[in-house]
Amino acid sequence: IVLRPSRVHNSEENTMRALTLKDILNGTFSYKTFFPNWISGQEYLHQSADNNIVLYNIETGQSYTILSNRTMKSVNASNYGLSPDRQFVYLESDYSKLWRYSYTATYYIYDLSNGEFVRGNELPRPIQYLCWSPVGSKLAYVYQNNIYLKQRPGDPPFQITFNGRENKIFNGIPDWVYEEEMLATKYALWWSPNGKFLAYAEFNDTDIPVIAYSYYGDEQYPRTINIPYPKAGAKNPVVRIFIIDTTYPAYVGPQEVPVPAMIASSDYYFSWLTWVTDERVCLQWLKRVQNVSVLSICDFREDWQTWDCPKTQEHIEESRTGWAGGFFVSTPVFSYDAISYYKIFSDKDGYKHIHYIKDTVENAIQITSGKWEAINIFRVTQDSLFYSSNEFEEYPGRRNIYRISIGSYPPSKKCVTCHLRKERCQYYTASFSDYAKYYALVCYGPGIPISTLHDGRTDQEIKILEENKELENALKNIQLPKEEIKKLEVDEITLWYKMILPPQFDRSKKYPLLIQVYGGPCSQSVRSVFAVNWISYLASKEGMVIALVDGRGTAFQGDKLLYAVYRKLGVYEVEDQITAVRKFIEMGFIDEKRIAIWGWSYGGYVSSLALASGTGLFKCGIAVAPVSSWEYYASVYTERFMGLPTKDDNLEHYKNSTVMARAEYFRNVDYLLIHGTADDNVHFQNSAQIAKALVNAQVDFQAMWYSDQNHGLSGLSTNHLYTHMTHFLKQCFSLSD
């Protein structure tokens, strides 16, 4: 199936050019998306190209600037946030990245009523997190690991927590492992819907072992970065959840929310918090052995001034075939009765589907069903539920938006996006205004991305928000590779793959093959999305065939495929890449003497193991920032899929699945190993151990480190990295420079 319709007529072919590496490194062919910053049912804010903050009213068609670029520039603001009462705007500047989501910044409060910055009781700097209450203009912020509250921007702050300490106690923000592997946010505090209460997490990292690495910088002596980082089997953070009344916080103080007894009996995690009403909150907890999750609904008891979490409002989700949930345990979306909710979890056939829970999970009503998966619930209104799935035409790598009418019986289902721009758009996400009065659809491909605005009642398209016209024009004289998404059926396993083919691809010729792999649990690489990236260049200019394969362990095709890797990472993911390569060779257009594999992070692990599989299939390969032993990686992630590295649990497979154990097998391949020395995520230790094992085995290999670079290898390192990898592959494939 060719997903990118050709825009080329033969007469124009001589004016066409191939992609260059420079195109990729300069981001020449990057696309834009438009996500409205909704502030009501019919209004949204957007930062214009010239940096004004503009308010749009869909119903009147009017727009006006609420904050000029001059005001933004006066404090070098790169971000903003309007208070719900529309009286104030916070302006964010001095952005300083910490980990994946976290950063610190300086915040200024601008008073829209008088056009001046609020003076007196200014915010301290740098702040770790700041947010408005959902109603009015209260502010909660985290400074030096403690939480503060302001009733009004000009008021003095009330300090809610006092025990915050760098690398020890985190209040209102997650520690490293919770940020990266559990919450996937920079914050750990949540306002109740009307701003009466503020819930927050406290993470105690006092007993967690610390990863230490050198940051070389420019000084005479390197700095040492210390991060409490629990590796598999190590001591984990201790979490507690508190709720404080923000109206008169000095009186009652923070109230600790009780942990369900069945969770508290052993090591556990807090996984998410969802406010239902101002006086009802839902917390999700997870056992350290992550196959049991408990959803607990707690109510505020006015007479006791406390939070009560009755056992009758505890809902257990358990997996008998793998871990609980997909990548994370799904979060509930509550209905208007404020007690029943919709949630995605596995049905009896092992497919993730939407269920409606009114009293118990056992009595859940299944809302969607089929041999496909519901992926995200966007919004529940009184009469509709909007969700995304990969049902349409049985392509797991697509995403369409559906509406189920829950107000009528039987509920009817409508695909909102399936036929809108069928060739161009097969992978959508959506953003809804209050009460789903309007919504934006963002299409990511396979054609050029486009963002559109729609009426929430009729689904009618109102206007195009961004259609990437400049990109479309820029690509007119570019010879883009062809892309196809197909599947292989092997031993009752379906292996979906994406193949990227050179522009003048000829099935009768032989091409070098590069496998790009990620392959991590609950990931998906074969997606119907638009991209002009490094592998596009390799196909377009260097004439390579690139393939991506979703094997066992990958997502959205049912639990059988997903949980196949449970407790045995590094086995089936590698097998399935190898199986696919053999099938590609059988197709007749692959030069079997020129096959390579590369991957980053989990993909670096898989590519390393594939190279060391002893099959003789691969001539060369690259591992960027690979995991080399699961004992070196984070507890929350690793143990979810592998259990504990203890004798009575799964130590044997931890030991068997290392890259180092296969050092001898690298002798007959060309291996390029790459890692950033300041990788906070997959520590440089992983590559250091691979290198040591290869040296000890007297196996030759190539390596590149990037000083002071993290897991993303950003900035100038990116250019160096892709240039270096290109040279390596061209040499491997005997392609002239």
């Epitope: 003095p156 300090q159 507690r240 000095a250 009652v252 923070p254 109230q255 600790e256 001034q305």
Partner: antibody
């Protein structure tokens, strides 16, 4: 009717220890933060320590930090203040009060602690 | 820490008169975090005005609290015989919570 009843005060030598108790009744003790406030003879009020409802977080005035420990037993509806390394300047009437940092809406009658050699 | 200064130190008034007691903070506090207490001789303090300028349960409406920022006032509209006592203001916005030194309202 809300009642707070302090006990455990008395005469103690400098460097000595005392444990004050406050028995609560008439309200759901386990739901509320509690504090200790003291008043030296003929002087004003001074906040000493506070503890949240679950007992999971405690707070102290600098003047007593490291020497005093606040705790509670919610099953017994009782608040405690363990006072070690007592000094002459700790001499005061010690009140237990319902509340965290402010709005102390119920107070006990107090118990006198005298530190003297 | 926040220092609260109460004035006057002593207020001599007759029953039926209006009493105005002042409390000044060394830093901005706001009424959400300021309370007033009454302490009779040999008695425990009693909450009069709760944080947020709200009268505490059972307190007669002749007592009222006002002010914002750093300046706060407790007003007793008509003094009754039982009102002659020491009055303390207290802030709860910052640790440690602190009390003013007190204003003694005595019978003239």
């Amino acid at each position: 009717e809300v009642q707070l009843l302090e006990s455990g005060g008395g005469l103690v030598q400098p460097g000595g220890s005392l444990r004050l108790s406050c028995a609560a009744s008439g309200f759901t003790f386990s739901s509320y933060a509690m504090s200790w406030v003291r008043q030296a003879p003929g002087k004003g009020l001074e906040w000493v320590s506070a503890i949240i409802s679950s007992g999971g977080l405690t707070y102290y005035a600098d003047s007593v930090k490291g020497r005093f420990t606040i705790s509670r037993d919610n099953s017994k509806n009782t608040l405690y203040l363990q006072m070690n390394s007592l000094r002459a300047e700790d001499t005061a009437v010690y009140y237990c009060a319902k509340g965290w940092f402010g709005g102390f809406n119920y107070w006990g009658q107090g118990t006198l602690v005298t530190v003297s050699s | 820490e926040i220092v609260l200064t109460q004035s006057p130190g002593t207020l001599s008034l007759s029953p039926g008169e209006r009493a105005t007691l002042s409390c000044r903070a060394s830093q901005s506090v706001t009424s959400s975090y300021l309370a007033w207490y009454q302490q009779g001789p040999g008695q425990a303090p009693r909450l009069l005005i709760n944080v947020g300028s709200r009268r505490a349960t059972g307190i007669p409406d002749r007592f009222s609290g006002s002010g914002s920022g750093t300046d706060f006032t407790l007003t007793i509209s008509r003094l009754e015989p039982e009102d002659f006592a020491v009055y303390y203001c207290q802030q709860g916005i910052m640790l440690p919570p602190t009390f003013g030194q007190g204003t003694k309202v005595e019978i003239k």
